[in-house]
Amino acid sequence: ASVATELRCQCLQTLQGIHPKNIQSVNVKSPGPHCAQTEVIATLKNGRKACLNPASPIVKKIIEKMLNSDKSN
């Protein structure tokens, strides 16, 4: 689940079994010149950044929930 910082794909691997309880925010990065794939980077309650699998149904659910809560705030 390491997150790199250079101008390339930031997610070297993704975490399995992520739970929404400790996710403070989610950043969805669309494919671009720096990286050919969609990347989902979550910031956890303790400040740690973790890469999530954008194809995972639970991750899709988490992103949807986060976007909906952003809209209602």
Partner: antibody, heavy 119, light 107 residues
Framework: QVQLQQSGAELVRPGSSVKISCKAS????????MNWVKQRPGQGLEWIGQ????????NYNAKFKGKGTLTADKSSSTAYMQLNSLTSEDSAVYFC????????????WGQGTSVTVSS | DIQMTQSPSSLSASLGGKVTITCKAS??????IAWFQHKPGKGPRLVIH???ILQPGIPSRFSGVGSGRDYSFSIRNLEPEDIATYYC?????????FGGGTKLEIK
């Protein structure tokens, strides 16, 4: 390596209070939720509640609200649970357990503290 | 609160054999189930989380499957050190709730 060291066994009187401790080492104590779990003799496990030492945030099982109070001391990396107005129903082994940050699985547990309520 | 119904409450099996324990949740728990091994005088040990992910250091003889409300946990090639009580735990919704436990004995 991660370790959770709990305080020793307690023999207490009905109606009194007890405070048990769980000293954490081997990780950033402030950054992980600490859970507390009860096991009565010959019975299963019951989740009491949890505390996030970083900001003092707590979640309680409604069944234990008012019975147990969770606190944490960041300077000593120690979590505490105070049990009030003790009755024989509170005689049990109490465990602390760290909750992993990303998937909330309880991955490390203390050895348990036995509390016996008896007159 | 979500209820977790675990069965059987006890079982006896032969060394080298296979056992399966089931847990049924009172509602969909989105695969957020963990399985613990508990031996007397010790703290419980996390074996599997998120339905099927094995904890580091746990032998591949242990496995878990399930979705929705129905989940199961299996141990194959039973060894003497597997004697323990096993619990499921749902952590989809607070309060976290455990199943009643399954005491495993060797014949």
């Amino acid at each position: 390596q991660v370790q959770l060291q709990q305080s020793g066994a307690e023999l207490v009187r009905p109606g009194s209070s007890v405070k048990i401790s769980c000293k954490a080492s081997g990780y950033a104590f402030s950054d992980y939720w600490m859970n507390w779990v009860k096991q009565r003799p010959g019975q299963g496990l019951e989740w009491i509640g949890q505390i996030y030492p970083g900001d003092g945030d707590t979640n309680y099982n409604a069944k234990f609200k008012g019975k147990g109070t969770l606190t944490a001391d960041k300077s000593s990396s120690t979590a505490y649970m105070q049990l009030n107005s003790l009755t024989s129903e509170d005689s049990a082994v109490y465990f602390c357990a760290r909750e992993r940050d990303y998937d909330v699985a309880m991955d490390y547990w203390g050895q348990g503290t036995s509390v016996t309520v008896s007159s | 609160d979500i209820q977790m119904t675990q069965s059987p409450s006890s079982l006896s099996a032969s060394l080298g054999g296979k056992v399966t324990i089931t847990c049924k949740a009172s509602q969909d728990i989105n695969k957020y189930i963990a399985w613990f091994q508990h031996k007397p005088g010790k703290g419980p040990r996390l074996v599997i989380h998120y339905t099927s992910i094995l904890q580091p250091g746990i032998p591949s003889r242990f496995s878990g499957v399930g979705s929705g409300r129905d989940y199961s946990f299996s141990i194959r090639n039973l060894e003497p050190e597997d004697i323990a009580t096993y619990y499921c735990l749902q952590y989809d919704n607070l309060p976290w709730t455990f199943g009643g436990g399954t005491k495993l004995e060797i014949k």
